[in-house]
């Protein structure tokens, strides 16, 4: 009886694992083996596919074959008993195009109200992703074990910290990789669960803000308790994108080590131009808090995004506000080389009810004021670039009295 050639050959490639699966064409014939050949583009001859010769099952692994993953390859299969079937040719394919990204490796660390996720590619030193290793981004799904309500977090890098969690609570998550340059989305990792710790005696510092005063940066934060010491550390932001690095070498800001106030002042020249991450930790001598949430700090924006300077021309029913460039020390105006938007807040001196105007122009009218009434005004600048979403601090409030009636001309 003539042997039929196998059908429905599927090629599954996950990372550097090459798996072939096929259907037997004749289940009634026993003791049949299967063999594959492969052919590279531009070659006439077929070569035996090592790992896939005389196979008794309907699956084989040819991962040991050192292929150029960007080169098209053709496969053929036949069945063998006493005689052989005709060859069945599989559609040619390029391994890289066909490959899926495997599940990443995930390690978790727990704090009381945060989880740190360390992610690395599932296959170390992968041949398939050798040129793309630096381009992996990850996404994850996290849920409380008790509720199952899922939250998705997209576009994260090889180390990610999730804040604002509950103490002594088990959270579960799964992670998948993506290569956006190649439109590839990977397979989810197995589910990993971790329990957050008991609540720490000392909470981390909160609401960290950086502002500029003269030639210095002023870093401020909030803290619940008095009589504490604080330390501040910085890290180059780009290091968070480095997939091979599991050690982030946070550095001390010398003027912010063991400070006893909820602020510290350090010279601008501590930082070269760039984007940094900052974090703060509190200690009472016996106990230490976990680190605060990390804030992003861009010297380019921070250095120049000073509160606007403005003049007020008072009328009976309105203020005309003229916004000028902020002054640095030495009274020299700062050149803003990116578009700004201005937020102007005003209120009646005797009231707390604030009103707000947002304007792109540098001359602004504040309408509908009462005559002979003292109003106070403060303003701040925002960058219009979404990526560099930054705001200056508010200017000092300036208070002026409106003119008597009928002077609006």
């Amino acid at each position: 009886k003539n042997l039929k050639s196998p059908q429905k050959v599927e090629v599954d490639i996950i990372d550097d694992n090459f798996i072939l699966r096929w259907n037997r064409s004749d289940e009634s014939v026993g003791n049949v083996t299967f063999s594959f050949d492969y052919q590279k583009t531009g070659m006439d001859n077929w070569i035996k596919l090592s790992g896939c010769q005389n196979i008794t099952s309907t699956k084989c692994n040819f991962s040991s074959l050192k292929l150029n993953v960007y080169e098209e390859i053709k496969l053929r299969i036949r069945a063998e008993k006493e005689n052989t079937s005709s060859w069945y040719e599989v559609d040619s394919f390029t391994p890289f195009r066909k490959a899926q990204i495997g599940p990443p490796e995930v390690h978790l660390e727990a704090e009381d109200k945060a989880i740190v996720i360390h992610i690395s590619p599932g296959t170390k030193d992968s041949v398939m992703w050798a040129l793309d290793g630096l381009s992996f981004t990850y996404s994850l799904v996290i849920w409380k074990n008790s509720s199952g309500v899922e939250e998705r977090i997209e576009n994260i890098y090889s180390r990610h910290k999730i804040y604002k969690l509950s103490p002594e609570t088990t959270y579960c998550l799964k992670v998948k990789a993506a290569l956006l340059t190649s439109w590839k989305i990977g397979v989810y990792s197995p589910v990993h669960c971790i329990k957050t710790t008991v609540e720490n005696e000392l909470p981390p510092p909160e609401n960290i803000e950086v502002s500029v005063q003269n030639q210095n940066y002023v870093l401020k934060w909030d803290y619940t308790y008095a009589n504490m010491t604080f330390q501040v550390q910085w890290l180059h932001a780009f290091l968070k994108r480095n997939p091979g690095n599991h050690l982030y070498k946070w550095k001390q800001i010398p003027d912010c080590e063991n400070v006893k106030t909820t602020q510290c002042v350090f010279p601008q020249n501590v930082f070269q131009k760039g984007i940094y991450l900052l974090r703060v930790q509190a200690s009472d001598g016996n106990n230490t808090s976990f680190w605060s949430e990390e804030i992003k700090f861009d010297t380019e924006i921070q250095a120049f995004l000073l509160p606007p300077v403005f003049n007020i021309r008072s009328l009976s029913d309105s203020f005309h506000i003229y916004i000028g460039a902020p002054k640095q020390s030495g009274n020299t105006p700062v050149i803003q080389d990116y578009p700004l938007i201005y937020e102007i807040i005003f209120w009646e001196n005797t009231s707390n009810a604030e009103r707000k105007i947002i304007e792109k122009k540098t001359d602004v009218t504040v309408p509908n004021l009462k005559p002979l009434t003292v109003y106070c005004v403060k303003a701040r600048a925002h960058t219009m670039d979404e990526k560099l979403n930054k705001s200056s601090v508010f200017s000092d409030a300036v208070c002026e009295k409106t003119k008597p009636g009928n002077t609006s001309k």
């Epitope: 390690h107 978790l108 660390e109 727990a110 704090e111 009381d112 740190v116 360390h118 971790i194 710790t197 008991v198 720490n200 005696e201 690095n245 599991h246 050690l247 982030y248 070498k249 550095k251 016996n286 106990n287 230490t288 976990f290």
Partner: antibody, heavy 118, light 107 residues
Framework: QVQLVQSGAEVKKPGASVKVSCKAS????????IHWVRQAPGQGLEWMGR????????KYAPKFQGRVTMTRDTSISTAYMELSRLRSDDTVVYYC???????????WGQGTLVTVSS | DIQMTQSPSSLSTSVGDRVTITCKTS??????VAWYQQKPGKAPKPLIY???YRYSGVPSRFSGSGSGTDFTLTISSVQPEDFATYYC?????????FGPGTKLDIK
């Protein structure tokens, strides 16, 4: 493969200094911290401090502050620990170890016995 | 400084027994705890990092658990080569500290 190879045993007089070396191979020393841990005979492990070979930044345990100096020479992938004003209770084995973030101290040197005796 | 206590300080056991060593820290250290095994005249050998992850090559009979201030190292079935001293280690904040050790010997 990753290895930390330490210098040989030393005998020193009280009041003298000792400098122990730790040569790294199989990895880029600048990507990690090198820690120093010591152990008295029959006793537990005691952390002395660490150096960042990238920029020579150090952190010392308060107990050794002022008496220990950690340095490095990245051109030969070597870290050093110098302990001054030696006393008889500094007769211990000194270990260097590689620190790898959440992986902690993942590789250790073989240890260097320093004997302080008059 | 963060103080670390280990119990028991020594333990006599037989091959095949299940053994648990506990470690307590004086403050919450998250999961920043590692365990090391040391035999006489040898350098410490890393077993567990980040509370519960085994270093590569460490047999699966070794496992770690806990978080916050309470941590355990478990050997599910003690083998002859496991008789040694075990140390826990916190790397949450400087100065890093080690537990005093637990000596495991043959009953």
């Amino acid at each position: 493969q990753v290895q930390l190879v330490q210098s040989g045993a030393e005998v020193k007089k009280p009041g003298a200094s000792v400098k122990v070396s730790c040569k790294a191979s199989g990895f880029n020393i600048k990507d990690y911290y090198i820690h120093w841990v010591r152990q008295a005979p029959g006793q537990g492990l005691e952390w002395m401090g660490r150096i960042d070979p990238e920029d020579a930044e150090t952190k010392y345990a308060p107990k050794f502050q002022g008496r220990v100096t950690m340095t490095r020479d990245t051109s030969i992938s070597t870290a050093y620990m110098e302990l001054s004003r030696l006393r008889s209770d500094d007769t211990v084995v000194y270990y260097c170890a590689r620190y790898h973030g959440y992986w902690a101290l993942d590789y250790w040197g073989q240890g260097t016995l320093v004997t302080v005796s008059s | 400084d963060i103080q670390m206590t280990q119990s028991p300080s020594s333990l006599s056991t037989s091959v095949g027994d299940r053994v648990t060593i506990t470690c307590k820290t004086s403050q919450n250290v998250g999961t920043n705890v590692a365990w090391y095994q040391q035999k006489p005249g040898k350098a410490p050998k890393p077993l567990i990092y980040s509370t519960s992850y085994r270093y590569s090559g460490v047999p699966s009979r070794f496992s770690g658990s806990g978080s916050g201030t309470d941590f355990t190292l478990t050997i599910s079935s003690v083998q002859p080569e496991d008789f040694a001293t075990y140390y826990c280690h916190q790397y949450f904040s400087y100065p890093y500290t080690f537990g005093p050790g637990t000596k495991l010997d043959i009953k």
